[in-house]
């Protein structure tokens, strides 16, 4: 092992203040004990240090901390968390939702970083599960953190933290991750009137089965094209055309200009002609009248 | 509170070796940033700082003394002693301990003189 | 040695304004914070400021300390007879580790 330089007489760092950041990197390293910087980590972020410089103090902290950081020590890292790799984060127990909120705000602004992503993961595997107000913090820094998660990750949310979700927090999940969430918003808001509960629900519809859209379409919900849009075509076409004029209401004009947009281009294709004209739009690729329609999954079934 | 308490002999010999011992409490000198020192003050005369020893066992001593000090801790007995070898009249002062908290002596003992007279 | 150079003595009548110097060098004042206490006839020292020119709680407003180069002062307005005492600098140092001055003897008129 090197030997080390010894700390100047005078110069031994009593306490973490802005003093410090006179100090050469070789200073730091023979004149600040790790064992006082770790209890006075809370004064770090204050100081106006040099990367190098936090190079030297994370340094002194790996030594100190070998097996990864207490949790007293995560909370206070400050900028210093952005000298973390994803391995030193592997190491931590972070417990504490304040814990979290600290570094997330750290990172704030930018783009989920591996390590923000490592911490998230540790975090939520600690816990167990995703609950409400960890998922009230994750998505307020990250809007698109819940669309992030794999079907099988999103399992383990309960239905109590769906209250958290906003609909922009939605924007980006594909429909594997929606037919997951779906039911579990469909129970936690199963208590809500009418009205009020498809506010709620709207965003997740895009995981929605035929049957619920049926149910809705007999609620007077007036639906926008934008939500209708991204539904399952799989759920969509066994609409009749009555279903989906009381499902969009006077939103039911916006068909037209989606008439060659999935889902609406294949919805046309599995309704009667005549049906489609009833809506008084000029939807046109609907099924001619006189045609027989089989349907050729119930025949699978039956056989 | 933070109390210091010096104690020793009131009267040395010269050439003869001196034992003082700070007993405190209030504090622990395990805590980072805290230590010990020892400082002394000749009748009538300035302060003169003697020795330190630090939460990390660190230890620093004055240049023109440092040959003939020593300063321990024992912290589950929450006490620090100095020892100065070789005493000379000129040593007779009251000798304080003194908490460094930070960079500063922010707790100081009542001090207790010792006279070094043959 | 006396490391940090203090006048012997200073004075001044009840509610004037005094100040005491403290000259030291680039090993102690330049490059380290200062330190003064107050020593009451027959007591203990006792910090009045840190770090230039922070007052520990209790200390009344009236006591100020700066610090310009390698020389620090500490003042006093609105003089006290409760004032009457040694003032003490002090800093750390590069080459002695810490270092007091040779002390102020205060008079109140």
């Known amino acids: 092992e090197v030997e080390k330089t010894a700390c100047p007489s005078g110069k031994k760092a009593r306490e973490i203040d802005e003093s410090l950041i006179f100090y050469k990197k070789w200073e730091l390293e023979a004149c600040v004990d790790a064992a006082l910087l770790a209890t006075q980590m809370d004064r770090v972020n204050a100081i106006p240090f040099t990367y190098e410089q936090l190079d030297v103090l994370k340094h002194k902290l790996d030594e100190l901390y070998p097996q990864g950081y207490p949790e007293s020590v995560i909370q206070h890292l400050g900028y210093l968390f952005l000298k973390m790799s994803p391995e030193d984060i592997r190491k931590w127990n972070v417990t504490s939702l304040e814990t979290l909120k600290a570094l997330l705000e750290v990172n704030k602004g930018h783009e989920m970083s591996p390590q923000v992503a490592t911490l998230i993961d540790r975090f939520v595997k600690g816990r167990g599960q995703l609950d409400k107000d960890t998922l009230d913090t994750l998505t307020a820094f990250y809007p698109g953190y819940l669309c992030s998660l794999s079907p099988e990750e999103l399992s383990s949310v309960p239905p109590s933290s769906i209250w958290a979700v906003r609909p922009q927090d939605l924007d980006t999940c594909d429909p594997r991750q929606l037919d997951v969430l779906y039911p579990k918003a469909r129970l936690a808001f199963q208590n809500m009137n009418g009205s009020e509960y498809f506010v709620k629900i709207q965003s997740f519809l895009g995981g929605a089965p035929t049957e619920d859209l049926k149910a809705l379409s007999q609620q007077n919900v007036s639906m926008d094209l934008a939500t209708f849009m991204k539904l399952r075509t799989d759920a969509v076409l066994p609409l009749t055309v009555a279903e989906v004029q009381k499902l969009l209401g006077p939103h039911v004009e916006g068909l037209k200009a989606e008439e060659r947009h999935r889902p609406v281009r294949d919805w046309i294709l599995r309704q009667r002609q005549d049906d489609l004209d009833t809506l008084g739009l000029g939807l046109q690729g609907g099924i001619p009248n006189g045609y027989l329609v089989l349907d050729l999954s119930m025949q699978e079934a039956l056989s | 509170q933070v109390q210091l308490k010096e104690s020793g002999p009131a009267l040395v010999k010269p050439t003869q070796t001196l034992t003082l011992t700070c007993t405190f409490s209030g504090f622990s000198l395990s805590s980072s940033g805290v230590g010990v020192s020892w400082i002394r003050q000749p009748p009538g005369k300035a302060l003169e700082w003697l020795a330190l020893i630090d939460w990390d066992d660190d230890k620093s001593y004055s240049t023109s003394l440092k040959t003939r000090l020593t300063i321990s801790k024992d912290t589950s007995k929450n006490q620090v002693v100095l020892t100065m070898t070789n005493m000379d009249p000129v040593d007779t002062a009251t000798y304080y301990c003194?908490?460094?908290?930070?960079?500063?002596?922010?707790?100081w003992g009542q001090g207790t003189l010792v006279t070094v007279s043959s | 040695d006396i490391v940090l150079t203090q006048p012997p003595s200073v004075s001044g009548a009840p509610g004037q304004r005094v100040t005491i110097s403290c000259s030291g060098s680039s090993s102690n004042i330049g490059n380290n914070r200062v330190s003064w206490y107050q020593q009451l006839p027959g007591t203990a020292p006792k910090l009045l400021i840190y770090?230039?020119?922070k007052r520990p709680s209790g200390v009344p407003d009236r006591f100020s300390g700066s610090k310009s180069g390698t020389s620090a002062s500490l003042a006093i307005t609105g003089l006290q007879s409760e004032d009457e005492a040694d003032y003490y600098c002090?800093?750390?140092?590069?080459?002695?580790?810490?270092?007091f001055g040779g002390g102020t003897k205060l008079t109140v008129l």
């Open positions: 003194a908490r460094i908290q930070g960079w500063n002596y922010d707790v």
């Open positions: 770090g230039n020119n």
């Open positions: 002090s800093a750390w140092d590069l080459l002695e580790v810490y270092v």
